[in-house]
């Protein structure tokens, strides 16, 4: 039967390598050996990829294409094939559509004054376009209490937050996760950090 | 960091064939392609030729009868070679790697070859 | 092919002089034109792409205008290590050529 697509590639970039699309099917579909999403910087001599895509679920494909040096005016052309069948065409400007690299080894260390210092990684390098971009959404969560959670917002340039003890129930077991976005970019959320967990104590 | 580096014979007979190889790291040589520009002493740039990401290469037709560049992508080297090399074939051998479209971002050192008997 | 023209061969100019050199192609070349700036020791480094997007740690002094067939590299203020020899570049088709380079020194 005719292979379609029912809802179109949707694409995100981290704006450093990788550029993921993903769709969906209208039946259930093996993604790597019916699909190809080939893949072309809109610039003379620019050369033409082709990215196997992978399935999300039983009707989504995901395809993640390495972009390399991603620069603010490059535009993508998109062409997702079923064998010799055009199914979509369209471009993809990475910055345009940013989604950061999640934030990395979140952890917390106890500071003076019955404060608690909780730490984590920029993910991009200095020299990357993201890096003094990034501002910070810090969700603090009682294990034991789905009630009891807070939510910090980080707009200031480290990737440090310093939280009261007496602001969490004493002798409660908390979990902390932290993603990032980049305001000038307009981006979406980066995923979620895995959280770390803490025993917090004050007296 | 992203690196280029000729490797050439320096000195070669007339008649005889050029071989250059260009050794990358930094990169892919499945996903960028490279060129081969020349500069004869005290002259412009000029343009060789230049292998695709897949493979597929393009020549200028001034030198494709005598032209072949070929590469290893899991030894991350590029070839030229050369036939029938005369005097006015001595210059200064660069490889580069493209950039947007036919932009060359980054260019070894160069290899100097003299052709000469 | 594409002729590339640079018909100023050589440039004298002051530091903290602002410096244009021009380059001409034979044909329109749809903005598809690129400059690189080559040392007396041979080292060969992109400056500008696609007529004015300026390269990733290139000074921002450097800028890149034109159309059509005209264009031009401006230095805004001269600095001691821009002293080289500057080269156009058509990237519209292949072959690709450059022009016969600029060379820039100090009065």
């Known amino acids: 039967g005719s292979v379609k697509v029912l809802h179109e590639p949707s694409c995100f970039s981290d704006y450093i390598s990788t550029s993921v699309c993903q769709w969906k099917m209208d039946h259930p579909t093996n993604c790597s050996a019916e699909l190809r999403l080939s893949y072309q910087l809109d610039f003379m001599g620019s050369e033409n990829h082709t990215c196997v895509p992978e399935n999300r679920e039983d009707s989504v494909c995901v395809c993640s294409m390495p972009i390399d040096d991603a620069v603010e005016a490059d535009v993508y052309q998109l062409d997702l094939w079923a064998g010799q069948q055009l199914l979509w065409s369209g471009s993809f400007q990475p910055s345009k559509h940013v989604k950061p690299r999640t934030p990395g080894n979140l952890t917390v260390h106890p500071n003076i004054s019955h404060t608690w210092l909780l730490m984590w990684t920029n993910p991009y390098p200095t020299e990357n376009h993201l890096h003094s971009e990034l501002t910070y959404m810090v969700n603090v969560s009682n294990d034991n209490d789905p009630e009891d959670f807070k939510v910090y917002n980080v707009t200031y340039m480290g990737p440090t937050l310093r939280l009261a003890a007496s602001t969490l129930k004493s002798g409660a077991s908390y979990s902390a996760r932290v993603r990032a976005w980049a305001q000038t970019y307009n981006s979406t959320w980066s995923d979620w950090s895995p959280s770390t967990t803490w025993l917090n104590y004050y007296e | 960091q992203v690196q280029l580096k000729e490797s050439g014979p320096g000195l070669v007979a007339p008649s005889q064939s050029l071989s250059i190889t260009c050794t990358v790291s930094?990169?892919?040589?499945?996903?960028?392609?490279v060129h081969w520009v020349r500069q004869p002493p005290g002259k412009g740039l000029e343009w060789l030729g230049m292998i695709w990401g897949g493979g597929s290469t393009d020549y200028n037709s001034v030198f494709k009868s005598r032209l072949s560049i070929s590469k290893d992508n899991s030894k991350s080297q590029v070839f030229l070679k050369m036939n029938s090399l005369q005097t006015d074939d001595t210059a200064m051998y660069y490889c580069?790697?493209?950039?947007?479209?036919?932009?060359?971002?980054?260019w070894g050192q160069g290899t100097s070859v003299t052709v000469s008997s | 092919d594409i002729q590339m023209t640079q018909t100023t061969s050589s440039l004298s100019a002051s530091l903290g002089d602002r410096v244009t050199i021009s380059c001409r192609a034979s044909?329109?070349?749809?903005?598809?034109l690129n400059w690189y700036q080559q040392k007396p020791d041979g080292t060969v480094k992109l400056l500008i792409y696609?007529?004015?997007r300026l390269q990733s740690g290139v000074p921002s002094r450097f800028s890149g205008s034109g159309s059509g067939t005209d264009y031009c590299l401006t230095i805004s203020n001269l600095e001691q290590e821009d002293i080289a020899t500057y080269f156009c570049q058509q990237a519209n088709t292949l072959p690709l050529t450059f022009g016969s380079g600029t060379k820039l020194e100090l009065k």
């Open positions: 044909q329109d070349i749809s903005n598809y």
């Open positions: 930094g990169f892919s040589l499945s996903r960028y392609s």
């Open positions: 696609y007529t004015s």
């Open positions: 580069a790697r493209t950039y947007r479209g036919y932009a060359l971002d980054y």
